[in-house]
């Protein structure tokens, strides 16, 4: 079996305040089983942005049909961007378990926020 890769094709994304930011992420395999999570920042203080498995994330929507079993596109859209949203976002694959364990992370996408056009 080919080892799963987490691909974040965009090194950086720039969005005007008030707009939506699309952060791209795909995986190359359905194995191992386990959810995708998005974080802002790295390390113990990272902030959970989206969890495929559970939780309520009102500003986040999935770009593709994530309800399909064969889905390998875990890109997300974050609405109403503000300067406080700036940072590096990581798409992280978890492996099912008790509890789920981190399996592989994407390289990250840096989100910068431009001033709202007047």
């Amino acid at each position: 079996e080919e080892e799963l890769q987490v691909i974040q094709p965009d090194k950086s994304v720039s969005v005007a305040a008030g707009e939506s930011a699309i952060l791209h992420c795909t995986v190359t395999s359905l194995i191992p089983v386990g959810p995708i999570q998005w974080f802002r920042g790295a390390g113990p203080a990272r902030e959970l942005i989206y969890n495929q498995k559970e939780g309520h994330f009102p500003r986040v929507t999935t770009v593709s049909e994530s309800t399909k079993r064969e889905n390998m596109d875990f890109s997300i859209s974050i609405s109403n961007i503000t300067p406080a949203d700036a940072g590096t976002y990581y798409c992280v694959k978890f492996r099912k378990g008790s509890p789920d364990t981190e399996f592989k992370s994407g390289a990250g996408t840096e989100l910068s926020v431009r001033a709202k056009p007047s």
């Epitope: 194995i31 089983v33 959810p35 495929q52 309800t67 079993r69 064969e70 889905n71 099912k96 008790s98």
Partner: antibody
Framework: AVTLDESGGGLQTPGRALSLVCRGS????????MGWVRQAPGKGLEFIAS????????HYAPAVKGRATITRDVGQSTVRLQLNNLRAEDTGTYFC?????????????????????WGHGTEVIVSS | ALTQPSSVSANPGETVKITCSGD??????YGWYQQKSPGSAPVTVI????KRPSGIPSRFSGSASGSTATLIITGVQVEDEAVYFC??????????FGAGTTLTVLG
């Protein structure tokens, strides 16, 4: 407590069809992969069929592919195995099995690599 | 396929190790299932490689490294006499099982 209770076994005639039912309690079958494992007399455990937590993904062992159908009824909390065109080699004890992983999101499979609960089994004898 | 020894024996109080090897990558887990008599219900003693279900004595433990899993019974007791099946999965099989290891507790 999680329990699995199988029924539907007994003496069967070759060529006929069989319907086994597994009733689960103590958990929601809509969140777990479920399956059937059989044991022929004097033999080991053999995977037969599984159904994913989504209720639509299924998998069958080569020995029963084309003859078996696994379905579930969330309301009744049951998993059913229909096995057609019975053969002598289908004789054995059929166990219902539940996977441990709670999977209520889309990209799960129908695998049973973390079985945490088994039924008591129902014996099937195929003989003329 | 999963390969495990056909039989092991031990005296009460000894430590027993049963191995299970296959083509398993890191993508799937191993479990261990105890069957006290043919046709009786298996009991899961280890799942997720090393997790013990509630109600299973602490003398049962498990580990996995690469494609090999090990069931360890520390201080084996007479009531542990049974057949132990290892189980896992592979890319084309949702569940695969070893042929079983018969544990005999002597004395």
């Amino acid at each position: 407590a999680v329990t699995l209770d199988e029924s539907g076994g007994g003496l069967q005639t070759p060529g006929r069809a069989l319907s086994l039912v597994c009733r689960g309690s103590g958990f929601s079958i809509s969140s777990y992969n479920m399956g059937w494992v059989r044991q022929a007399p004097g033999k080991g455990l053999e995977f037969i069929a599984s159904i994913g937590s989504d209720g639509s993904s299924t998998h069958y062992a080569p020995a029963v592919k084309g003859r078996a159908t696994i379905t579930r009824d969330v309301g009744q909390s049951t998993v059913r195995l229909q096995l057609n065109n019975l053969r002598a080699e289908d004789t054995g004890t059929y166990f219902c099995a539940k996977d441990a992983y709670q999977c209520s999101y889309a990209t799960c499979n129908d695998y049973l690599d973390t079985i945490d609960a088994w039924g008591h089994g129902t014996e099937v004898i195929v003989s003329s | 396929a999963l390969t495990q020894p056909s039989s092991v024996s031990a005296n009460p109080g000894e430590t027993v190790k049963i191995t299970c090897s296959g083509d398993n990558s890191a993508h799937y887990y191993y479990g261990w299932y105890q069957q006290k008599s043919p046709g009786s219900a298996p009991v899961t003693v280890i799942y997720y490689n090393d997790k013990r279900p509630s109600g299973i004595p602490s003398r049962f433990s498990g580990s996995a490294s690469g494609s090999t899993a090990t069931l360890i019974i520390t201080g084996v007791q007479v009531e542990d006499e049974a057949v132990y099946f290892c189980g896992s999965a592979d890319s084309s099989n949702p569940a695969i099982f070893g042929a079983g290891t018969t544990l005999t507790v002597l004395g």
